[in-house]
């Protein structure tokens, strides 16, 4: 390649190369939830399946006690879907009676717990008013985005009401993260 | 690894390095659907545009006959959005008449078909009750997550009612996957 | 390698390797919007926080004047969530009076502006009819997909009604992109 200069500078490598197959990754799927104690004014955390069916963790990304454990600092794409289901919310009944009402709601939060900050950090929130006319309702909330995480950080998914979560199928409610 | 700090091993390479630009990728966009025969109790599959406008397939990721064909084993991020639209669902009319009703619903499923398993596998499902008050309604369902796929696997998007899919714009209804 | 045919293996490198940590990336978070002039029939663009809290831009991905600027050609995953909130839409009130009505709606569009094309390109659209029974409503629209972008392209997020956007929390409304 005599006399050939290297191509544009974004192709230069300023950090160690690494094989993509070696990156921390996890996809967790829903399981039936057992009622757990949680702090007042703090949404309960879901726990997850991490090895059966579609679920997996790999390359030092581990799952334990409701948390995904981040084994390596870097930028991660984090996502979750929670499917909720319930009976008619009180809202529509009150509405029928002619009294406007602050609607019921469903909320999903992906939360980071880090030792470099004393308070859990809400990374992503999906929140939706529920004021259904039909007798039974169901709907998903999906979230996903990229965040800079530190080695040792812990991720969890919190929901406004654990009893409304559809835990029946692994494709309806899930949680995942992968190092970019 | 009790009490062990996370090793800095992620800088070691245990798998072949590969250029990111060489990875299988596809983004497919909606086209007008032609009614097709499908099995009873099985949702019909959408077919897609794979080369015009925003749509593309590259690096041996091919599209054929409603399926994305996986050319290489690995972890893929798979996503789809389907925008549905319809007239007032029966639900609200029945509700008006004072009869509670199981609501109508809209559902999207991303399905994997694999040689090594006789049954299609539902990877992702977004399902929502539809019980609208207005005369015309429209709304998207978005799905996305990471899965370990094998060379030769096929991916498709199934919907509960093909006639409700908004096929008018390539940015409203789409399907994609890329090797991580 | 005399006489050896090139293997079909995906482990061969046809493009320059590059460190993942060197790739253009951004995650932008919502700020309070100031009313801005926008063309009739064109949705207004949101502006964003790019460095405080969870927000960041890195590796030559810059944010300026409502636009993410693409510094390098390639395939990008682009995503956004916008949380909307409002009072009861007119729709249900009109419905109460017995007049069917085209429902109000909320829409998010991720738009690409490119030098080589006179018209902005709509990459992603999430649009939903809003016909709520309760007095206050709120809900997110999430979008995400992969697109081939060119160096110099600009990305923005447009919404149907800027006054309905929930700007109160960085985890509710956000916009991001990263080179794959």
């Amino acid at each position: 390649l005599k006399g050939q200069e290297f191509a544009p500078s974004h192709q230069q490598v300023y950090a160690p190369l690494r094989a993509d197959g070696d990156k921390p990754r996890a996809h967790l799927t829903v399981v039936r939830q057992t009622p757990t104690q949680h702090f007042k004014n703090q949404f309960p955390a879901l726990h997850w399946e991490h090895e059966l069916g579609l679920a997996f963790t790999k390359n030092r990304m581990n799952y334990t006690n409701k948390f995904l454990l981040i084994p390596e600092s870097g930028d991660y794409f984090i996502y979750s879907q929670v499917t909720f289901r319930g009976m008619t919310s009180e809202c529509s009944e009150i509405r029928q009676a002619g009294r406007p009402n602050k609607p019921d709601s469903i909320t999903v939060v992906i939360t980071k717990v880090t030792d470099s900050y004393p308070e859990p950090t809400q990374l992503l929130m999906g929140t939706k008013s529920v004021c259904e006319v039909g007798s039974n309702w169901f709907q998903p909330i999906y979230l996903g985005a990229m965040f800079s995480l530190q080695e040792g950080d812990k991720l969890m998914v919190n929901v406004s009401d654990i009893s409304l979560v559809d835990y029946t199928k692994e494709d309806k409610t899930f949680f995942g993260a992968f190092l970019l | 690894l009790k009490g062990q700090e996370f090793a800095p091993s992620h800088q070691q390479v245990y798998a072949p390095l590969r250029a990111d630009g060489d990875k299988p990728r596809a983004h497919l966009t909606v086209v007008r659907q032609t009614p097709t025969q499908h099995f009873k109790n099985q949702f019909p599959a959408l077919h897609w545009e794979h080369e015009l406008g925003l749509a593309f397939t590259k690096n041996r990721m091919n599209y054929t006959n409603k399926f994305l064909l996986i050319p290489e084993s690995g972890d893929y991020f798979i996503y789809s959005q389907v925008t549905f639209r319809g007239m007032t669902s029966e639900c609200s009319e029945i509700r008006q008449a004072g009869r509670p009703n199981k609501p109508d619903s809209i559902t999207v499923v991303i399905t994997k078909v694999t040689d090594s398993y006789p049954e299609p596998t539902q990877l992702l499902m977004g399902t929502k009750s539809v019980c609208e008050v207005g005369s015309n309604w429209f709304q998207p369902i978005y799905l996305g997550a990471m899965f370990s796929l094998q060379e030769g696997d096929k991916l498709m998007v199934n919907v509960s009612d093909i006639s409700l899919v908004d096929y008018t714009k390539e940015d409203k209804t789409f399907f994609g996957a890329f090797l991580l | 390698l005399k006489g050896q045919e090139f293997a079909p293996s995906h482990q061969q490198v046809y493009a320059p390797l590059r460190a993942d940590g060197d790739k253009p990336r951004a995650h932008l978070t919502v700020v309070r919007q100031t009313p801005t002039q926008h063309f009739k029939n064109q949705f207004p663009a949101l502006h964003w926080e790019h460095e405080l809290g969870l927000a960041f831009t890195k590796n030559r991905m810059n944010y300026t004047n409502k636009f993410l600027l693409i510094p390098e050609s390639g395939d990008y995953f682009i995503y956004s969530q916008v949380t909307f909130r409002g009072m009861t839409s007119e729709c249900s009130e009109i419905r109460q009076a017995g007049r069917p009505n085209k429902p109000d709606s909320i829409t998010v569009v991720i738009t690409k502006v490119t030098d080589s094309y006179p018209e902005p390109t709509q990459l992603l659209m999430g649009t939903k009819s809003v016909c709520e029974v309760g007095s206050n409503w709120f809900q997110p629209i999430y979008l995400g997909a992969m697109f081939s972008l060119q160096e110099g392209d600009k990305l923005m997020v447009n919404v149907s009604d800027i006054s309905l956007v929930d700007y109160t929390k960085e985890d509710k409304t956000f916009f991001g992109a990263f080179l794959l």
Epitope: F39, L69, V113, T114, E119 | F6 | -
Partner: antibody, heavy 116, light 106 residues
Framework: QVQLQESGPGLVRPSQTLSLTCTVS????????MHWVRQRPGRGLEWMGR????????KYNPSLKSRVTITRDTSKNQVSLRLSSVTAADTAVYYC?????????WGQGSLVTVSS | DIQMTQSPSSLSASVGDRVTITCRAS?????MYWYQQKPGKAPKLLIY???NLASGVPSRFSGSGSGTDFTFTISSLQPEDIATYYC?????????FGQGTKVEIK
């Protein structure tokens, strides 16, 4: 009520190993991180290290790393500190601290004297 | 290590005075924490994330700053504020504290 209680011998001989236990109550300590901080007489505060009880992942102050070990026992809701080869310079009040979930909580401290 | 340089090391002020303590980090940090320690007691968190007031802490305490320079302020000194105040960064390894500022009443 959230509580952290340090316990252990108040006197340790030089060259021996200092061992302290922190027993927590009122919260799931796997949801947070547990640190050890010490304060030598008339001196400021020195961070020694921390453990994530969920994963047992530890981080240590490099200046103490060769001598310090932090472990946890989830069945007992306890975190333990071991500091080997102690000298008189290790005489201090040792605090167990919770972080990662407000409020930031400190134990009342345990005075350990290193003396022969 | 990230060194934390706190100043002054001690100060004496009257009840009602505005008191300011500064902390400089040897390299940029995202967050700063401020603690109050009374004699014979464990430190108590007052400010986290540079400017957030911890639960139950009176509003006369405040924090500000970013990067390497941070400030802690007591807007109106009260007799119960007699204590030693420490800044701390939670980012680099090791976590490090300032050397402390002893606040006394004139």
């Amino acid at each position: 009520q959230v509580q952290l209680q340090e316990s252990g011998p108040g006197l340790v001989r030089p060259s021996q190993t200092l061992s302290l236990t922190c027993t927590v109550s009122g919260f799931d300590f796997q949801d947070t991180y547990m640190h050890w901080v010490r304060q030598r007489p008339g001196r400021g505060l020195e961070w020694m290290g921390r453990i994530d009880p969920a994963s047992e992942h530890t981080k240590y102050n490099p200046s103490l790393k060769s001598r310090v070990t932090i472990t946890r026992d989830t069945s007992k809701n306890q975190v333990s500190l071991r500091l080997s080869s102690v000298t008189a310079a290790d005489t201090a009040v040792y605090y167990c601290v919770r972080s990662g979930g407000l409020p930031d909580v400190w134990g009342q401290g345990s005075l350990v004297t290193v003396s022969s | 290590d990230i060194q934390m340089t706190q100043s002054p090391s001690s100060l004496s002020a009257s009840v009602g005075d505005r008191v300011t303590i500064t902390c400089r980090a040897s390299s940029s940090v995202s967050y700063m924490y401020w603690y109050q320690q009374k004699p014979g007691k464990a430190p108590k968190l007052l400010i986290y994330g540079a400017s957030n007031l911890a639960s139950g802490v009176p509003s006369r305490f405040s924090g500000s700053g970013s990067g390497t320079d941070f400030t802690f302020t007591i807007s109106s000194l009260q007799p119960e504020d007699i204590a030693t105040y420490y800044c701390q960064q939670w980012e680099g390894n090791p976590r490090t504290f300032g050397q402390g500022t002893k606040v006394e009443i004139k």
